[in-house]
């Protein structure tokens, strides 16, 4: 925050230490700052060319002294304009200017390609004060140049809002060719053409490219970088690389493998993760993808029962996550399961088949033909039924569960009876007279209780009524049967 507009709040350059020795009296060189590491660069250039002052960017600041003396134009002295050197060599270059002591707050800074080099630890500045002027030599050194050091360097001095700019010093770092684009590994279809690209730069230019396939040169004549190699097609895997040549020597790219796409190998390690009565969860380890990503997989399921018709169920699924739940299987059944996967070329062979079994389940259907009749003499209700079809028992029958509900004048009472698996009839005591009895039966296996049959109703009269015909399970669609007496 400064009053004078011309006195900019702008940083001045970095003068790194340590400095050897201390400041002397006014007329000896001040702040002579050698390279911090003590390294003597391989290339050094004189700060000035005697004689001609630089005329490109001259500032005649709009300031006069107390005595109104006009000021001479200020300019950096000419210096070397272009430095060519090899990578990893050292370089030192500088710009110099004589500043009249009227300018008591100059700032000097180094710039590269239009950007200020802030905090550059290799910039040093020497001051040579005199009664009238201070000679300033700003040096910039790089101990081991890299390609990134290529560019145009300038000094800038700010004085009273005027900017004085030195002539550019072009640094050109030469070295072996440097790859900007190298061939990349590819997976290709057999006998199908494809391209490989190789690009390298200097300096020095030009850079010429040779292609190499399986250690043998492909092209007799070099191609100027960048180069595109068109390979008409391969029948087997090959390794390609490119050589980049310039006047400094040769650089070889990485070798890249070109693979031929093929059908995948069969999946391995198909395993059972979980089994229920009607489903099996399987997982598998995919085989080698044949250099082409898997698209999907097919699960093949066969009944292992020798009496089965040998038909195969096929379930298609995505290639990931190597997991599939096979559904709609029969309970307590044995199955052979195999997995095959495909890529863009085709299907793999089927994995080794594995044997899997479903567990026992609850029956899937209720007992059939349920009939109910009143045996008035013994004050019992007789119930008869037919067991569910074997295939739908989903396990070994262990018995039946009978639900009988008694309803009379707004009172309702449900009772459950367990019956052993033998036989297909049961007798229950009359609980309430002058009431309706509703009966339902479910088959039971170790896998659980199956669905209850449709309800069958019978009216139980008061004592002394005659025994009438039984109630039975209605035909589908009929209303609940009720025996009216």
């Amino acid at each position: 925050a400064i009053t004078e507009a011309r006195e900019e709040a702008k940083p001045y350059p970095l003068f790194p230490g340590p400095f050897p020795g201390s400041l002397q009296t006014d007329h000896t060189p001040l702040l002579s700052l050698p390279h911090a590491s003590g390294y003597q660069p391989a290339l050094m250039f004189s700060p000035t060319q005697p004689g001609r002052p630089h005329t490109g960017n001259v500032a005649i600041p709009q300031v006069t002294s107390v005595e109104s003396k006009p000021l001479p134009p200020l300019a950096f002295k000419h210096t070397v304009g272009h430095i060519i050197l090899s990578e990893h060599k050292g370089v030192k270059f500088n710009c110099s200017i004589s500043v009249p002591n009227i300018y008591q707050d100059t700032t000097i800074s180094w710039w590269k390609d239009g950007k200020e080099l802030l905090g550059a630890h290799h910039a040093i500045t020497q001051f040579y004060p005199d009664d009238e002027v201070t000679a300033i030599i700003a040096s910039f050194s790089i101990t081991s140049v890299q390609r990134s050091d290529n560019g145009s360097y300038i000094c800038k001095m700010k004085i009273n809002n005027e900017e004085i700019v030195s002539d550019p010093i072009y640094i050109e770092v030469q070295g072996l060719p440097h790859f900007t684009k190298q061939p990349e590994s590819m997976n290709v279809t057999r006998n199908t053409a494809f391209n490989l690209t190789c690009q390298a730069v200097g300096p020095p230019e030009p850079v010429n490219i040779f292609w190499v396939q399986n250690s043998s040169r492909v092209n007799e004549q070099p191609e100027k970088s960048p180069s595109v190699l068109t390979v008409p097609g391969l029948t087997e895997m090959a390794v390609f690389s490119c050589e980049a040549h310039n006047d400094k020597g040769l650089t070889v790219s990485k070798g890249v493998q070109i693979n031929i796409k093929a059908i995948p190998s069969p999946p391995t390690e198909v395993s059972i993760r979980n089994s229920t009565a009607h489903s099996i969860l399987i997982s598998w380890v995919p085989g080698f993808d044949g250099y082409s990503p898997f698209r999907n997989c097919s699960i093949q399921v066969k009944e292992a029962d020798p009496l089965s018709n040998g038909s195969v169920m096929i379930f298609n699924t995505s290639a990931l996550p190597h997991l599939y739940q096979i559904k709609q299987l029969q309970a307590l059944a044995n199955y052979s399961i195999g997995v095959s996967c495909m890529n863009e070329i085709g299907w793999s062979a089927v994995s080794p088949w594995i044997l899997a079994s479903t567990t026992e389940g609850a029956p899937s259907v209720a007992p059939l033909n349920v009939t109910v009749f009143l045996n008035e003499s013994s004050d019992n209700v007789d119930i008869r039924w037919m067991k569910p079809p074997t295939k739908q028992q989903d396990g070994e029958l262990v018995g039946y569960r009978i639900s009988h509900v008694w309803q009379s004048a707004g009172i309702s009472k449900e009772l459950l009876e367990e019956v052993g698996q033998n036989g297909s009839r049961a007798r229950i005591s009359v609980q309430v007279h002058n009431a309706t009895c509703t009966v339902r039966i479910a088959a039971v296996t170790r896998g659980g209780v199956g669905p209850f049959s449709d309800p069958v109703k019978i009216f139980i009269p008061a004592h002394g009524w005659v025994d009438y015909a039984p109630s039975s399970t209605p035909a589908p669609g009929n209303a609940d049967p009720v025996l009216i007496i």
Partner: antibody, heavy 120, light 107 residues
């Protein structure tokens, strides 16, 4: 021997004006700018600004615009700090400090300080 | 404005010891930091400029280091005449700003 010798202590009343001098010797006065620094009693240092001793052009920090005037007299190799319309908060020690080399902004030599007391 | 935070405020040491005073800048000031010593009733004396460059006549017991935002003044083999206030100055950007100072006492 480079020296900056400041004028003696001052006792002033609010509203008055004071002018503190800083006499340089042992070097060419017009080759180095002169800075002014304030130190409040028991407090730290505050940069007030500087004067270009070749052109006489002053530069003030924000807090010291208005009542503060930097001036110089080349023939006497002296720089001056004038404070107008004094306030109690101007009570402090004021230092002059010479700028180092041309392209740098640090101070290499300081005056011994002038104590100003403003009190009614 | 750039704030210079100096620590410690007070330091007690013995003759022959080694002490370090630090200044932390609120933004990058490259190597533009100076260190000064002030004894009561005397003018401040320049010790270090440009972070590590010793001023004329300053004993090599005084060493400056640092760049960017963190700076240190180290006094090795402390002597009785080193009893003083020490402060830093950033001279990278206007307005120039000082650290709060460190009072060094000799036991």
């Amino acid at each position: 021997l480079i020296q900056l010798v400041q004028s003696g202590p001052e006792l002033k009343k609010p509203g008055e004006t004071v002018k503190i001098s800083c006499k340089a010797s042992g070097y060419t006065f017009t080759n180095h700018g002169m800075n002014w620094v304030k130190q409040d009693p028991g407090k730290g240092l505050k940069w007030m600004g500087w004067i270009n001793t070749y052109t006489g052009e002053p530069t003030y920090a924000d807090d010291f615009k208005g009542r503060f005037v930097f001036s110089m007299e080349t023939s006497a190799s002296a720089a001056f700090l004038q404070i107008n319309n004094l306030k109690n908060e101007d009570t402090a020690t004021y230092f002059c400090a010479r700028k180092g080399v041309t392209a740098a902004r640090y101070f290499d030599y300081w005056g011994q300080g002038t104590t100003l007391t403003v009190s009614s | 404005d750039i704030v210079m935070t100096q620590s410690p405020k007070f330091m007690s040491t013995s003759v022959g010891d080694r002490v370090s005073i630090t200044c932390k800048a609120s933004q990058n000031v490259r190597t533009a930091v100076a260190w000064y010593k002030k004894k009561p009733g005397q003018s401040p004396k320049a010790l270090i400029n440009l972070a590590s460059n010793r001023h004329t006549g300053v004993p090599d017991r005084f060493t400056g280091s640092g760049s960017g935002t963190d700076f240190t003044l180290t006094i090795s083999n402390v002597q009785s005449e080193d009893l003083a206030d020490y402060f830093c100055l950033q001279h990278w950007n206007y307005p120039l700003t000082f650290g709060g100072g460190t009072k060094l006492e000799i036991k």
